[in-house]
């Protein structure tokens, strides 16, 4: 499999058949698949060097692994997008052997002197062809030469099979399955041959191809493949319930932010709640996690403005739950990215020198910002797309707080909507779905560059749109939701999570 280790070294060779038998639409589809693969790999913070070859009668090398920009995923994608099926129109035979020889030449070193660390670099060949080679001879011989060059399968004690993977995608109207199977790697419990039909669900294909065991702690990563559970799709999501004897129980959501911490809303708890009465579950697991301590933001005080006629005041409505035992990360339990951390800088593929302010400009620009939250409906987690009103609609969004029960007599809306809040909901630019009571404490998320970054904590809403556990379809335009802006509580997060290796900026 493609071992995605951010600290490892890898070369990926993309080889695309542009011969007559492929056809223009299949060629475009294959290109799109490769673009998606480059993006998927880049989303792991891995920077392999790419080689890019198209071929028909002759190969054409578009990107060499030795080029300075070969590890710049955006640049490689640009080169790939600029390739046309017409480029091989005049010489449109199928010489797969020559194409693989071009890969061999990129792999080999001048003067036969192996460079330092050559044996630590993993090589991945992704060949997109119909297998109908009609000139140049059998391409399998080049695969043998490549294995020989990389010293694979020679030493029984150290066969080095992990250092070469050959994936073959059958593209085109007619595919010679025998030829394709012959070229692909054969490894136990791994799939190295894919068909056109597979390419309709690329996430399933990538799931078969990628080994992410070295990067399970990366924040904001998800799997969207069809066999995945709700928690593959939102592995940070935590369910919280507080059991209060004789008072029933309170349900909230939260987000895993480190091996020991879940971030949620402070209003989910009272000062009387004992640690053993708080239940947290993650990853869709049935068992509850033991709680060591709940840390409230020191400025949170729900009764803070009672004297001023404000029955409930949600400023600084955030809390961190520290778990007694460390979470074991896996595909269904992973942290979400937090603002102003090194992890988020890498997730957004920004320069290491990026400041907190620059992250804020990237994630919360002064405009309508596409975001999402996760809600549970009929025992299923679903993503709800909303827009954070952070531009010209911000004022009107915040003013609608006056329609919230108990806030009708508030003279100045800034008394309740402090600078700590982000506002969603309403009907412009689109009709946003609203949060329900049980969504409180869950993350408000921005999805960027295939990664998920938490920007807010769901706090309160103007209208209860979920009476009788059902989300109403028709809601008034003033149905707004308010979320604690994480950029506004960073000093507290930084202090409380200082031992969690998140690398706050």
């Amino acid at each position: 499999k493609i071992v995605l280790d951010p600290s490892g070294s890898m070369n990926i060779y993309l080889v695309l058949d542009g011969s007559d038998s492929i056809g223009a639409s299949n060629f475009t589809g294959a290109k799109k698949c490769l673009v998606n693969l480059i993006e998927k790999v880049a989303s792991y913070g891995v920077k392999p060097r790419y080689g890019l070859v198209t071929y028909a009668t002759y190969p054409k090398i578009w990107v060499k692994v030795s080029e300075a920009d070969s590890s710049n995923a955006d640049w490689v994608t640009k080169q790939l997008n600029e390739i046309n099926y017409e480029d091989h129109k005049l010489k449109s035979g199928t010489n797969t052997k020559k194409a693989l020889q071009a890969v061999y030449s990129m792999m080999s070193w001048p003067d036969d002197v192996p460079p330092e660390g050559w044996n630590r670099t993993r090589h991945v060949i992704i060949l997109m062809t119909d297998g109908l080679h009609n000139m140049g001879g059998d391409p399998i011989t080049v695969i043998d030469e490549i294995r020989d060059l990389l010293y694979i399968g020679k030493d029984r004690k150290n066969p080095r099979e992990d250092y070469l993977d050959v994936y073959v995608f059958g593209v085109g109207p007619l595919v010679n399955q025998v030829n394709i199977n012959a070229l692909a790697s054969k490894k136990d419990n791994e799939q190295h041959v894919f068909k056109v039909k597979d390419m309709e669900n690329l996430e399933d294909v990538f799931y078969q191809m990628i080994d992410e065991s070295q990067s399970l702690s990366l924040c904001g990563m998800v799997w969207e493949h069809r066999k995945g559970t709700d928690y593959h799709k939102q592995p940070w999501q935590a369910k919280i319930s507080v059991i209060r004897p004789s008072k029933g129980h309170e349900s909230c959501m939260g987000a895993v932010v480190s091996e020991y911490f879940v971030l949620t809303a402070a209003h989910c708890f009272t000062v009387d709640d004992k640690e053993h009465s708080i239940k947290v579950s993650v990853g869709g697991e049935k068992r509850d996690l033991e709680i060591e301590v709940v840390l409230f933001h020191p400025n949170y005080n729900i009764n803070g403005k009672k004297e001023a006629g404000i029955p409930e005041f949600y400023d600084y409505d955030v809390a961190l739950i520290k778990l007694k035992n460390k979470l074991k990360y896996g595909q269904t339990i992973r942290p979400i990215c937090l603002p102003c951390t090194e992890g988020t800088t890498r997730a957004l593929r920004l320069p290491p020198t990026t400041t907190c302010q620059q992250q804020k400009e990237e994630l919360l620009p002064a405009q309508d910002i596409k975001a999402l939250f996760v809600s549970e409906e009929e025992k299923k987690l679903t993503r709800k797309e909303v827009y954070i009103k952070n531009g010209d609609k911000k004022g009107s969004c915040e003013r609608d707080a006056q329609y919230a029960p108990g806030y009708d007599k508030v003279k100045d809306i800034s008394e309740v909507v402090t600078p700590r809040f982000l506002c969603t909901g309403g009907v412009s630019p689109y009709a946003d779905p609203n949060t329900c009571r049980g969504d409180s404490g869950g993350p408000l998320i921005v999805h960027k560059r295939s990664r998920f970054i938490q920007v807010g904590v769901i706090s309160w809403g103007v209208v209860d749109v979920c009476k009788n556990q059902k989300r109403q379809k028709q809601v008034p335009a003033h149905a707004r939701d308010f979320h604690i802006n994480l950029f506004q509580v960073l000093p507290w997060l930084k202090e409380k999570l200082q031992d969690e290796d998140l690398g706050f900026l």
Epitope: K274, E275, E292, V293, L320, K322, K326, D499, D501
Partner: antibody, heavy 121, light 107 residues
Framework: EVQLVQSGAEVKKPGESLRISCKGS????????IHWIRQSPSRGLEWLGY????????DYNQKFKDRVTISADKSISTAYLQWSSLKASDTAMYYC??????????????WGQGTLVTVSS | DIQMTQSPSSLSASVGDRVTITCRAS??????LAWYQQKPGKAPKLLIY???TLQSGVPSRFSGSGSGTEFTLTISSLQSEDFAVYYC?????????FGQGTKVEIK
């Protein structure tokens, strides 16, 4: 200055009960964990358990869970370690120590002077 | 429980010597390792936590390094007051566990 002052040495018979104390001063007692550790020549240093003095939440090393009880009285900034029925194998020096601020993954930065418990018939 | 193994169990050194003590964990504890110094009749004293962070008030001749399962305490230039027993302790997972100790004696 941060100080943890423990109660004096104890000599007890097997089967007797005992409670030793640890009084914290020079810091906000309710903001930090209190841990109990014992030391004997044969078994070295062993962590017994800890308490959140603010909420009373405690947890134990499974090995000692049925032998000791950890409690605290935040009104007098004092933590306790108690036994309902002592054994000769409980003979050791017992230390209380301050852990990190609640929520932090810190080691024990201040230690009491120790309480020597001797159990002998 | 995580086992902590220190080596050597004792060593003899002179004032001014560079001394290195190793601690190995039975499974990865990330960076969460502490080092303590204990003198006869006294309680242990924290020197280093989180693998390499010097506790305030501790002389800079003490340093810690390592992560995962292998850790090292180094005393760059041994002073007469440094002759004592040194313990490592993991503070990553409960129950917290200690090494068996390394006695640093005068040569």
């Amino acid at each position: 200055e941060v100080q943890l002052v423990q109660s004096g040495a104890e000599v007890k018979k097997p089967g007797e009960s005992l409670r030793i104390s640890c009084k914290g001063s020079g810091y906000t007692f309710t903001n930090y964990w209190i841990h109990w550790i014992r030391q004997s020549p044969s078994r070295g240093l062993e962590w017994l358990g800890y308490i959140n003095p603010n909420t009373g939440y405690n947890d134990y090393n499974q090995k000692f869970k049925d032998r000791v009880t950890i409690s605290a009285d935040k009104s007098i900034s004092t933590a306790y370690l108690q036994w309902s029925s002592l054994k000769a194998s409980d003979t050791a020096m017992y230390y209380c120590a301050r852990g990190g601020q609640l929520g932090l993954r810190r080691a024990m930065d201040y230690w009491g002077q120790g309480t020597l418990v001797t159990v002998s018939s | 429980d995580i086992q902590m193994t220190q080596s050597p169990s004792s060593l003899s050194a002179s004032v001014g010597d560079r001394v290195t003590i190793t601690c190995r964990a039975s499974k990865s504890i990330s960076k969460y390792l502490a080092w303590y110094q204990q003198k006869p009749g006294k309680a242990p004293k924290l020197l280093i936590y989180s693998g390499s962070t010097l506790q305030s008030g501790v002389p800079s001749r003490f340093s810690g390094s390592g992560s995962g399962t292998e850790f090292t305490l180094t005393i760059s230039s041994l002073q007469s007051e440094d002759f004592a027993v040194y313990y490592c302790q993991q503070h990553d997972e409960y129950p917290w566990t200690f090494g068996q100790g390394t006695k640093v004696e005068i040569k």
